[in-house]
């Protein structure tokens, strides 16, 4: 679809003559008839197949024709066509004299032909005017012409339709050849695919307008390259969507089992020692003078047997005092009025005089202690066994009976059960005081992750296009890890054909 445009510039008929040799009376009041048709080697009568047009009276005898863009007598003349421009044409321009109406002379009776010209040739579509001048014995016509495409038509033959748009069906302008030129932010054959935010992950992200980056399920962040942990996860992270990889000190399927209760909750009071013992489990080892599950209870002041030499202890609100037996005195009945002559040393202890007979000192045999060697040695009073070990008196010495997971003279060494890598199939090992605990990866169970779960969600092969299936955090949940070029929770659609976006 296009327009053949003819610009009439000058007509000369200086003698004011008609084609039949007669003069015009009083002068040749001239209008033009134009006939445009398909190319003919010999111009013949018949319909003007490409269009025809007439002008009003443009002047008398000889005159210059100015451009006029509106109203009657528009110049250049417009001959629109709604087909593919063939590149060739035949054009007949006739000059006529009318005695009648200036504006619609072609309807007047008594019109007479002044002259005519016929042009046959080729003409390419373009903005440039082709100029020509035709002379015959009586007249001269100067004119120019061109073919241009109608609005929204492009190409060598005005056959390519392109209408610029900026809506849901496309966002483009038109190039001179009719090809689409996408507006900024859009791409695709019809400029209907938005260009996402730079760096937006091409599988995990998508957009419905330019510079957006919306994440597909399971992904987050500005570029959709960070995974989202499982819905039920409490203290864990992920490396693939819906995973729950436990933070340090947490275990269990949803990382909700506290493996480090001591650090997270500090349950042991009054300076006691806390030892973890399994999920949410712990033991408090109290300092002397305290008791209770959390060492929160203070023992009686007399509980430490502060009175020596058989003195009896009496508790007061914030203190105590010792009632001493005959022959002893002092805050703790530690001083004696006896001498070696009174044979004060028991259990074979030997007596030594001090201070010119005013006092004495007992040297006790092994396993006995006290001012008078009256006490059997308890080598466990100093709580020498660490990590909840049990202290046992063994004659002149003592031994520590350690809890599982500990060793050493004082149970001070931790045995790492995990050093033996007891967890199968990539299970994560946690050293607990009553033995190792394995947190199993998806698809495995058992104390050592040795049992393969076969009835999981991956058994049905739910992932498409060669994707790898991982079972999630419950037997009927799964995650598909898509190969390059595919997306979706089951890798069911290719990246090149994203799901259509609702508008």
């Amino acid at each position: 679809s296009g327009i053949f445009q003819l610009r009439l510039q000058e007509f000369a008929n200086e003698r004011g003559m008609l084609a039949n040799g007669r003069p015009c009376e009083p002068g040749c009041r001239t209008f033009f008839r134009i006939c445009l048709k398909h190319y003919q080697a010999t111009f013949s009568e018949g319909p003007c197949t490409f269009g025809n047009v007439s002008t009003p009276v443009l002047g008398t005898n000889s005159f210059v024709i100015r451009d006029k863009n509106s109203g009657s007598g528009r110049n250049p003349l417009q001959l629109p066509f709604n087909f593919t421009w063939p590149g060739t044409f035949s054009l007949n321009i006739q000059a006529w004299h009318t005695p009648g109406d200036d504006l619609r002379p072609e309807t007047s009776p008594g019109n007479s032909l002044i002259s005519q010209i016929i042009i046959q040739g080729s003409l390419a579509v373009g903005k440039n005017w082709k100029s020509d001048e035709q002379n015959n014995t009586l007249t001269r016509l100067r004119y120019s012409y061109r073919v241009v495409c109608s609005d929204n038509y492009y190409g060598d033959s005005c056959s390519r339709l392109c209408k610029k748009r900026d809506d849901h069906f496309g966002h483009y302008e038109c190039q001179p050849d009719g090809s689409l030129s996408c507006l900024p932010g859009w791409t695709g054959k019809y400029c209907d695919q938005p260009i996402c935010l730079s760096g937006c992950h091409e599988q995990n992200g998508y957009c419905s307008k330019p510079d957006e980056c919306n994440c597909r399920p399971g992904w987050q962040g500005p570029l959709c390259n960070e995974c989202i942990p499982h819905n039920g996860c409490r203290h864990g992270t992920c490396t693939i969507p819906w995973q729950c990889a436990c933070d340090e000190g947490w275990g269990g399927l949803f990382c909700d089992q506290d493996l480090n209760y001591c650090t997270h909750h500090s349950p042991c009071k009054n300076g006691s020692t806390c030892s973890n013992s399994g999920p949410r489990g712990y033991t408090c080892t109290c300092l002397p003078g305290y008791t209770g599950e959390h060492c929160e209870l203070e023992l009686s002041k007399c509980a430490s047997n502060p009175c020596r030499n058989g003195g009896s202890c009496k508790d007061h609100e914030n203190s105590y005092h010792c009632l001493c037996p005959p022959g002893y005195y002092g805050q703790h009945c530690e001083h004696s009025t006896l001498t070696c002559a009174d044979s004060p040393c028991f259990n074979g202890g030997s007596c030594r005089e001090r201070n010119q007979g005013a006092s004495y000192a007992c040297e006790c045999p092994p396993n006995f202690t006290g001012s008078n060697c009256e006490k059997k040695v308890d080598r466990c009073t100093s709580n020498p066994c660490a990590n909840g070990g049990q202290c046992l008196n063994r004659g002149p010495s003592r031994t520590c009976r350690c809890r599982p997971g500990f060793t050493g003279t004082h149970c001070e060494l931790h045995i790492s059960d995990c050093a033996r890598s007891p967890c199968a199939h990539g299970g994560t090992c946690h050293d607990l005081e009553n033995g190792p605990v394995c947190t199993c990866p998806a698809g495995f169970s058992g104390r050592r992750c040795e049992v393969r779960i076969t009835n999981d969600a991956c058994a049905s092969g739910p992932c498409f296009n060669g994707a790898t299936c991982y079972t999630g955090l419950s037997p009927n949940n799964f995650v598909c890890n898509c190969p390059y070029g595919f997306v979706g929770s089951r890798c069911e659609f290719p990246v090149g054909l994203p799901p259509s976006f609702p508008w």
Epitope: Q220, I228, P229, H235, G236, R490, E492
Partner: antibody, heavy 118, light 107 residues
Framework: EVQLVESGGGLVQPGGSLRLSCAAS????????MSWVRQAPGKGLEWVAS????????TIGDSVKGRFTISRDNAKNSLYLQMNSLRAEDTAVYYC???????????WGQGTLVTVSS | DIQMTQSPSSLSASVGDRVTITCRAS??????LAWYQQKPGKSPKLLIF???VLADGVPSRFSGSGSGTDSTLTISSLQPEDFATYYC?????????FGQGTKLEIK
Amino acid sequence: EVQLVESGGGLVQPGGSLRLSCAASGFTFGNFPMSWVRQAPGKGLEWVASISSSDSWATIGDSVKGRFTISRDNAKNSLYLQMNSLRAEDTAVYYCARGYYNSPFAFWGQGTLVTVSS
Amino acid sequence: DIQMTQSPSSLSASVGDRVTITCRASQEIYRNLAWYQQKPGKSPKLLIFDTSVLADGVPSRFSGSGSGTDSTLTISSLQPEDFATYYCQQYTYYPPTFGQGTKLEIK
């Protein structure tokens, strides 16, 4: 136990501002994306905004874009919603929820009522 | 935006009944669908995600199914505590959208 506790709601005039807070406990807050969802009286649920876990990338719903902003402070285990240029149609119970705009909302707070009225 | 249409909008049933609520999306949502339960004056509670996966602590009488655009929530034997409003939600496309809700009442 996961707990989300919203605060900051109340009565505000049209054009006014309000800042909602959500205190989280019972999970490692910094590991999870968070969202705000609202519910107008007697109506259904409407997603308002989401924020990613680590880099605090905010995504805001069209109905409140340019007026509301979502933010978080992982050190304080807190989520916030700054609401400016409030309109009558923003009247709703606002819920803090654990989840992103492309995931289920696994845990919800008890909600805080925002009333916009002159 | 994706439109989520629940049916019915309200439903009367008795304890022990089997109840089905459906949710239709305006286009394919690839199983990325959740169901929530909300009791009056309370916040919503996640029941089911990924169309059929039961959330932690949810009784097994609740189940979900569906594919493409249609999803279903089924309660196999209604208990007194199940009378509430139920919402579906899609999370395939931005923005996430909810159904208008189905109110389940005692007959």
